[in-house]
Interface confidence: low
C-alpha cells in the first residue's frame, strides 16, 4: 500500500481539490494502483480510470468497470490496463501491465453517475528506468496540450509490483458473494432435508437468517456459467 511522506517533502502549494498520489513502478513490470473510496457514498456506481493530458483539461477514458455494477469485481482489460472494483471494501484497483516509460503521466480514478464523473483520486504514475528497456510502442503525452502540474500537492507513494501471473487475494465482495451463495445452498439443502425428514411439502422456504450484509446489490439468485474472466473494455474506447 502506498505510504505518504511528510508535507514538507511533497510538492509545492495546494490549489487542487484532490491531492495527487504518486505511484512508482519499474519499466517492464506491472504496477498496481489503488484508489480507496467511501463504499456507501459511491454505492451502485461504476468506476473508471482515465488519463489526463493537462491539469485542467478533460480526462480521457482508458478503461471502466463492468457495465453491470454487480459484476464490478470482474477484471476488465483495455490493452495492457486492467480495472477491478471491490465495491464493499471500497477499493478500486488498476493494474498497468508491462509498464513502459511512456506510461508515466497524470491519471484519475473516477466514480461515474449519469454523464458526470467524480474524482476519487488523482494519480501520478512514475516509471523507474529499467536497464533492459526495449523501447516499444506505447503512450506519450502531447506537450502542446499539457499544462503545468506545479500546483499539485503530491503525496509520494511506492506501489508494490504485481508479478506476472500472480493472483491477487480476492476482494471482499467476491468472498462475501461466495459465502452468501454457499450458505444459501446449505440453508436450502437443510430445508429440503428437513421437509423430507418430516414428510412436509417443500413449497416454502424458511426465512433466511443471513441477509448478506443487507446489500440489495448482492442478492443474486444464481450466476450460471459465470467465471472470473477478463473483460475487454469495448464500450468505453
Amino acid at each position: 500500500y502506498p505510504y505518504d511522506v511528510p508535507d514538507y517533502a511533497s510538492g509545492g502549494g495546494g490549489g487542487l481539490e484532490h491531492n495527487t498520489t504518486v505511484f512508482q513502478g519499474v519499466a517492464g513490470q506491472s504496477l498496481q494502483v489503488s484508489c480507496p473510496y467511501d463504499s456507501m457514498k459511491h454505492w451502485g456506481r461504476r468506476k473508471a480510470w482515465c488519463r489526463q493530458l493537462g491539469e485542467k483539461g478533460p480526462c480521457q477514458r482508458v478503461v471502466s468497470t463492468h457495465n453491470l455494477w454487480l459484476l464490478s469485481f470482474l477484471r476488465r482489460w483495455n490493452g495492457s490496463t486492467a480495472i477491478t472494483d471491490d465495491t464493499l471494501g471500497g477499493t478500486l484497483t488498476i493494474t498497468l501491465r508491462n509498464l513502459q516509460p511512456h506510461d508515466a503521466g497524470l491519471y484519475q480514478c473516477q466514480s461515474l453517475h449519469g454523464s458526470e464523473a467524480d474524482t476519487l483520486r488523482k494519480v501520478l504514475v512514475e516509471v523507474l528506468a529499467d536497464p533492459l528497456d526495449h523501447r516499444d510502442a506505447g503512450d506519450l503525452w502531447f506537450p502542446g496540450e499539457s499544462e503545468s502540474f506545479e500546483d499539485a500537492h503530491v503525496e509520494h507513494s511506492i506501489s508494490r509490483s504485481l508479478l506476472e501471473g500472480e493472483i491477487p487475494f480476492p476482494p471482499t465482495s467476491i468472498l462475501l458473494l461466495l459465502a452468501c451463495i454457499f450458505l444459501i445452498k446449505i440453508l436450502a439443502a437443510s430445508a429440503l432435508w428437513a421437509a423430507a425428514w418430516h414428510g412436509q411439502k417443500p413449497g416454502t422456504h424458511p426465512p433466511s437468517e443471513l441477509d448478506c450484509g443487507h446489500d440489495p446489490g448482492y442478492q443474486l439468485q444464481t450466476l450460471p456459467g459465470l467465471r472470473d474472466t477478463d473483460y475487454k473494455d469495448d464500450d468505453d474506447k
Partner: antibody, heavy 122, light 113 residues
Framework: EVKLLESGGGLVQPGGSMRLSCAAS????????MNWIRQPAGKAPEWLGL??????????EYNPSVKGRFTISRDNTQDMLYLQMNTLRAEDTATYYC?????????????WGQGVMVTVSS | DILINQSPASLTVSAGEKVTVSCKSS????????????LAWYQQKPGQFPKLLIY???YRHTGVPDRFTGSGSGTDFTLTISSVQAEDLAHYYC?????????FGAGTKLELK
C-alpha cells in the same frame, strides 16, 4: 485495419477553391486528432493543421502559412475529415495527405492516407 | 516556429552498412512534464506516403524492424539503420511535435550503390 482515403483533388485555377475529403475507417474516429499534411513534388512534407478529438471539443490548430485560407472540419457521423482550401495559389500545388495522430504517440502521425494530388494552375 | 536541420541531404551506401541520419532542432524538444522528446522519424519510399518509424525520439512504431533505432535528446537526434537492406531505399524525414506548427526536416535520401 486503419484506413484513410483522400478524395477531391484535381486541377484548379489560381484564386479558386477546392474541398478535399478523407474517409476514415478501422478505428473510433471521434477518439483521434486528425491532420492534413501536404508535400510538393520532391520536397519535404508540410503540416497544415489538425482538428482535435471529441474530448477536446474538435478544436483546430493551423500552420500560419495557411491560416485564414484553409479550414479543417470533420463529420463524425460519417467518419469524414475535410480540408476547405480557398484563394489557392500556384505554391499550393502538392500531394495532400490526411493523417491520424494517436494521442498516445506524442503528436506523431501513425497512419496516413495514400494522398491526393492538387494542381493549382491557369 | 521550430526549425529542423536534417543532414545529410543524401547518402549512398552498400547493403549491410550502418547508416546515421541527424536532425537538429532550433530549440529543445524535451518536455519536462513527461520527460519525453517530441521528435518522430518517417520513411517514405518512392511513390508512397510517409510511414512512421520512430516516435518520442526513440520508440519504435509497431512493426518497425529493430535495425531502425532512434536516439538523442533535447536538440540533437539521430536515426540509425544498423544494417541497411535493399528495401530501406527511401527518403527519411524527422518531424518535431513539440509545438505548433509541427515542422519537418528537409529529408535525407538514402540510395544504394
Amino acid at each position: 485495419e486503419v484506413k484513410l482515403l483522400e478524395s477531391g483533388g484535381g486541377l484548379v485555377q489560381p484564386g479558386g477553391s477546392m474541398r478535399l475529403s478523407c474517409a476514415a475507417s478501422g478505428f473510433t474516429f471521434t477518439d483521434f486528432y486528425m491532420n492534413w499534411i501536404r508535400q510538393p513534388a520532391g520536397k519535404a512534407p508540410e503540416w497544415l493543421g489538425l482538428i482535435r478529438n471529441k474530448a477536446y471539443g474538435y478544436t483546430t490548430e493551423y500552420n500560419p502559412s495557411v491560416k485564414g485560407r484553409f479550414t479543417i472540419s470533420r463529420d463524425n457521423t460519417q467518419d469524414m475529415l475535410y480540408l476547405q482550401m480557398n484563394t489557392l495559389r500556384a505554391e499550393d500545388t502538392a500531394t495532400y495527405y490526411c493523417a491520424r495522430i494517436g494521442i498516445n504517440y506524442g503528436g506523431s502521425l501513425d497512419y496516413w492516407g495514400q494522398g491526393v494530388m492538387v494542381t493549382v494552375s491557369s | 516556429d521550430i526549425l529542423i536541420n536534417q543532414s545529410p541531404a543524401s547518402l549512398t551506401v552498400s547493403a549491410g552498412e550502418k547508416v546515421t541520419v541527424s536532425c537538429k532542432s532550433s530549440q529543445s524538444l524535451l518536455y519536462s512534464e513527461s520527460n519525453q522528446d517530441y521528435l518522430a522519424w518517417y520513411q517514405q519510399k518512392p511513390g508512397q506516403f510517409p510511414k512512421l518509424l520512430i516516435y518520442g525520439a526513440s520508440y519504435r512504431h509497431t512493426g518497425v524492424p529493430d535495425r531502425f533505432t532512434g536516439s538523442g535528446s533535447g536538440t540533437d537526434f539521430t536515426l540509425t539503420i544498423s544494417s541497411v537492406q535493399a528495401e530501406d531505399l527511401a527518403h527519411y524525414y524527422c518531424e518535431q511535435t513539440y509545438s505548433y506548427p509541427y515542422t519537418f526536416g528537409a529529408g535525407t535520401k538514402l540510395e544504394l550503390k
